[in-house]
Interface confidence: medium
């Protein structure tokens, strides 16, 4: 599923991401835009043999199990395929664990490079939330 901007903002708010660990909803929508272009089925492979999955591009070395990543930790205790569902519950729950891990949203390279320090509220402007 490819979400619309406001559709995703509403879904993320319903799942309790607005101001989760101090990060406003705009940060999460911005991260999803530049990680996956709002596509729940996005996958991208990394040079270390891991793969990033889903709307927030969650990594298989640390956070989920795809059955084939060397030394996978699966800290969210889920199959990576669950992160590709049109229902973003699994991605949100895992993202909450990631953002609580110490580095905050810096865990997402795209957020660090494209969203951090920008007007992230623009990503929810005009949305009925």
């Amino acid at each position: 599923k490819v979400f619309g901007r406001c559709e995703l903002a509403a879904a993320m708010k319903r799942h309790g991401l607005d101001n989760y660990r101090g990060y406003s909803l705009g940060n999460w929508v911005c991260a999803a835009k530049f990680e996956s272009n709002f596509n729940t089925q996005a996958t991208n492979r990394n040079t270390d043999g891991s793969t990033d999955y889903g709307i927030l591009q969650i990594n298989s070395r640390w956070w989920c199990n795809d059955g084939r990543t060397p030394g996978s930790r699966n800290l969210c205790n889920i199959p990576c395929s669950a992160l590709l569902s049109s229902d973003i519950t699994a991605s949100v729950n895992c993202a909450k664990k990631i953002v609580s891990d110490g580095n905050g949203m810096n865990a997402w390279v795209a957020w660090r490079n494209r969203c951090k320090g920008t007007d992230v509220q623009a990503w929810i402007r005009g949305c009925r939330l």
């Epitope: 089925q41 996005a42 996958t43 492979r45 040079t47 043999g49 795809d66 059955g67 084939r68 990543t69 060397p70 199959p79 990576c80 395929s81 590709l84």
Partner: antibody, heavy 116, light 107 residues
């Protein structure tokens, strides 16, 4: 138990296309990558690429881009590989395998012969 | 691409002998190396995963070792059913690659 059942042998003319199937049973098809491997005598085993059936995500070995196309049907638990513009170089045994990094589960192989 | 070089290409042995097959990677692949046996007209069969982990159902006479670039598959006291081709495969990076194979034949 996990099984992968491939379609039968094919004899094709040069320039034609062929679609090989791989039906999976015994596990959740959508959650594991399906890999495709080519074997020609004297050429060993070559990795063609992979598809994640649940999302349709595909990755191809550069060498096979434009030659192979992967699809999957989660309603029938079947993965497909189409090979186009066939030449004698495409004559080989083609295997599907479940992608766990290693390959514990293989299909029985589909023999493709390209001959005029 | 990571190249895997297997040696020797052919190994002629008598049942009861112990043998070692080599697989060398063109760059370090940690322990992300797997071994397969293939008999004529059959699909490959996984023997060892991650360099040294014996796959379930595989006889204990098979063992694997190595890390980085140099790997070895050992067969302690070869049996007649062990003759065939042996391939190594790396899962450290894409594209996945296989070695050219070692043929284990009866002397």
């Amino acid at each position: 138990q996990v099984q992968l059942q491939e379609s039968g042998a094919e004899v094709m003319k040069p320039g034609a296309s062929v679609k090989i199937s791989c039906k999976a049973t015994g596990y959740t098809f959508s959650t594991y990558w399906i890999e495709w491997v080519k074997q020609r005598p004297g050429h060993g085993l070559e990795w063609i690429g992979e598809i994640l059936p649940g999302s349709g995500s595909t990755y191809y070995n550069e060498k096979f881009k434009g030659k192979a196309t992967f699809t999957a049907d989660t309603s029938s638990n079947t993965a497909y590989m189409q090979l186009s513009s066939l030449t004698s170089e495409d004559s080989a045994v083609y295997y599907c395998a479940r992608g766990d990094g290693w390959y514990c589960y293989w299909g029985q192989g589909t023999t493709l012969t390209v001959s005029s | 691409d990571i190249e895997l070089t297997q040696s020797p290409a052919t190994l002629s042995v008598t049942p009861g002998d112990s043998v070692s097959l080599s697989c060398r990677a063109s760059q370090s692949i940690s322990n992300n190396l797997h071994w397969y046996q293939q008999k004529s007209h059959e699909s490959p069969r996984l023997l060892i995963k991650y360099a040294s982990q014996l796959q379930s159902g595989i006889p204990s006479r098979f063992s694997g070792s190595g890390s980085g670039t140099d790997f070895t598959l050992s067969i302690n006291s070869v049996e007649t059913e062990d003759f065939g081709m042996y391939f190594c495969q790396q899962s450290n990076s894409w594209p996945r690659t296989f070695g050219g194979g070692t043929k284990l034949e009866i002397k």
